[in-house]
């Protein structure tokens, strides 16, 4: 229904705390360089204004759209051009063009320092002093670094953060209580970020239809007992929610997500038998829980897929009558039978089925043509299954760090023109798939591996778009989202690449490396590994292993030495010479 004042409506629906959190996230995602204090001031002004509209919906400006109100606030910021350059030009536009302009200027890789966690004692002190400000800082810091983070989900992670601090700050050993718990939240939040970015990419590049197909497949796997009409309704609602969040309409997004959670909990009987535990939780936990609820048990009496989609004489007639509905039904029926497949694979199969019907239904004898379509799915299914087996075997043999290194070598050979920091970040993220997925039961591995890899490769594509340097990467990133992972997997050594000159300074290290945390040490070593491959793209695995073992031994020796600086300055050049010889 239409409301006289949109801002009053959202404030009433969401409540002050969530309203303020979402406005802070929205501003932080749009203007990523502003300080917390600048944004907190704007949020307070917007909240005060919302309250006046709640008191009187007819008050001045209360009838304005949220984009107009928020955009006017952002455009009133002093020194906008000095701090944000051409983003300031957005302010010369009218809505809805102004909001579109803001969206286009979101930076997926802002030049901000890594979000450093303060030490436990300091964290607990500032949390106890002012929990609201502390959580505000968290929302601001995460949102500005992840401008497409799913806003209602970020509120959930902030709530988790809050609960962990409340619990651990009361403990004697705050550090050992906080560290593992906050690491866990951080890991989950980073995965959530890349997954949501993938959804927004799908929406931005291929439109709502592409996202809705993703949602139909995913929901059908999770709720195999729900009928097609129910799945379509959920997919339509979920598409609206994600469209709003990806479009910066965070208040509407959070409000609609809460509505969707409410609907699901009120209609458990027609959706799934697994929802009750989620539905007993408070709002943020409930929506989060529903988003990752376990798959319902598949109906025992499902007929073979061939009956309606291959053997039926009416296939082409049904396809002609309503292409999207017929293909949607195919995707639903196939997905509910295959919780063991990735969504990407299911979408590839649906695409293959569509292409087959397009070709065969135009022939004089369609049934003879599409009769073999299910057999033609086989290679499409085998390819990711082999990928999972090969990579999980390698992960089990090498462990996470070694697996990351193997991926780093592979990807540096595929796209040596890509910057080393991007390659290292990508390989580290891709390598985490082992820890995340390879330990799961067999039937959960494929969906976990492939859908996670797809999300990480989406980030690779986004970073590469900013500064395109590799034709290989451009080729894989230009195609459809579901074809990206197979495209990257199929890439081989880039034969067009002219190897980098050997620069001794790239492989020169100093004693400061010894005091770095383990993660930072790994990144330094992985940076050197990528540079080695760029110097010798055709180096064998054996040669690279020799060099890296030598390098690890050098670090170990010098970091244990009494005079570290002398060790690094005398042994370092020897290491460089040995490396050159080993790779000659």
């Amino acid at each position: 229904e239409a409301h006289k004042s949109e801002i009053a409506h959202r404030y009433n629906d969401l409540g002050e705390q969530h309203f303020k959190g979402l406005v802070l996230i929205a501003f932080s995602q749009y203007l990523q360089k502003c300080s917390y204090d600048e944004h907190a001031k704007l949020v307070q002004e917007v909240t005060d204004f919302a309250k006046t509209c709640v008191a009187d919906e007819s008050a001045a400006n209360c009838d304005k759209s949220l984009h107009t109100l928020f955009g006017d606030k952002l455009c009133a910021i002093p020194n906008l051009r000095e701090n944000y350059g051409e983003l300031a030009d957005c302010c010369t536009k009218q809505e809805p063009e102004r909001n579109e302009c803001f969206l286009q200027h979101k930076d997926d890789n802002p030049s901000l320092p890594p979000f450093e966690r303060p030490e436990a004692e300091a964290m607990c002190t500032s949390f106890k002093e002012n929990p609201t400000t502390f959580m505000g800082h968290y929302l601001h810091e995460v949102a500005r670094r992840h401008p497409y983070f799913y806003a209602p989900e970020l509120l959930y992670y902030a709530e988790q953060y809050n609960e962990i601090l409340t619990q651990c700050c009361a403990e004697a050993d705050k550090e050992s209580c906080l560290t593992p718990k906050l690491d866990g939240v951080k890991e989950k939040a980073l995965v959530s970020s890349v997954r949501q970015r993938m959804k927004c990419s799908s929406m931005q590049k291929f439109g709502e239809r592409a996202f809705k197909a993703w949602a139909v497949a995913r929901l059908s796997q999770t709720f195999p007992n729900a009928d097609f009409a129910e799945i379509t309704k959920l997919a339509t609602d979920l598409t609206k929610v994600n469209k709003e969040c990806c479009h910066g309409d965070l208040l509407e997004c959070a409000d609609d997500r809460a509505e969707l959670a409410k609907y699901m909990c009120e209609n458990q009987a027609t959706i799934s038998s697994k929802l009750q535990t989620c539905c007993d939780k408070p709002l943020l936990k409930k929506a989060h829980c529903l988003s990752e609820v376990e798959h319902d048990t598949m109906p025992a009496d499902l007929p073979a897929i061939a009956a309606d989609f291959v053997e039926d004489q009416e296939v082409c007639k049904n396809y002609a009558e309503a292409k999207d509905v017929f293909l949607g039904t195919f995707l639903y029926e196939y997905s509910r039978r295959h919780p063991d497949y990735s969504v990407s694979l299911l979408l590839r199969l649906a695409k293959k089925y569509e292409a087959t019907l397009e070709k065969c239904c135009a022939e004089a004898n369609p049934p003879a043509c599409y009769g073999t379509v299910l057999a033609e799915f086989q290679p499409l299914v085998e390819e990711p299954k082999n990928l999972v087996k090969t990579n999980c075997d390698l992960y089990e043999k090498l462990g996470e760090y070694g697996f990351q290194n193997a991926i780093l070598v592979r990807y540096t050979q595929k796209a040596p023109q890509v910057s080393t920091p991007t390659l290292v970040e990508a390989a580290r993220n891709l390598g985490r798939v082992g820890t995340k997925c390879c330990t799961l039961p067999e039937d959960q591995r494929l969906p976990c591996v492939e859908d996670y890899l797809s999300a990480i490769l989406n980030r690779v594509c986004l970073l590469h778009e900013k500064t395109p340097v590799s034709e290989h990467v451009t080729k894989c990133c230009s195609g459809s989202l579901v074809e990206r992972r197979p495209c990257f997997s199929a890439l081989t050594v880039d034969e067009t690449y002219v190897p980098k000159e050997f620069k001794a300074e790239t492989f020169t290290f100093h004693s400061d490396i010894c005091t770095l945390p383990e993660k930072e040490k790994q990144i330094k070593k992985q940076t050197a590994l990528a540079e080695l491959v760029k110097h010798k793209p055709k180096a064998t695995a054996e040669q690279l292993k020799t060099v890296m073992d030598d390098f690890a031994q050098f670090l170990d020796t010098c970091c244990k030495a009494a005079d570290k600086d002398t060790c690094f300055s005398t042994e370092g050049p020897n290491l460089v010479t040995r490396c050159k010889d080993a790779l000659a």
Epitope: Q313, E314, V315, C316, K317, Y319, A320, E321, E358, C361, A362, E363, A364, N365, P366, P367, A368
Partner: nanobody, 115 residues
Amino acid sequence: KVQLVESGGGLVQPGGSLRLSCAASGFTFSSFGMSWVRQAPGKGLEWVSSISGSGSDTLYADSVEGRFTISRDNSKNTLYLQMNSLRAEDTAVYYCTIGGSLKQSSQGTLVTVSS
């Protein structure tokens, strides 16, 4: 909504000719192969002929081969069946269908071959 409307049927003497038409709407006509099927009084549906979307490929039942010709005009979204040398056993209701369908979903047009 997919619609198929057949016309051109009637009473004809053995050895005579008729041209059936099927006007199609509600779908991308040129993307779909089309067929003619028929149902004689008291009998089941029988496939008669099929044509590809482009019109380049045609198929005929042995019983009509050499006497019937299927064709289409994609600019007019229309399917045709030219029937020559008609026989008493060609008496039936003729339906046009999409793809390989053997179910009639339209009214059909009655062809009666009788002296």
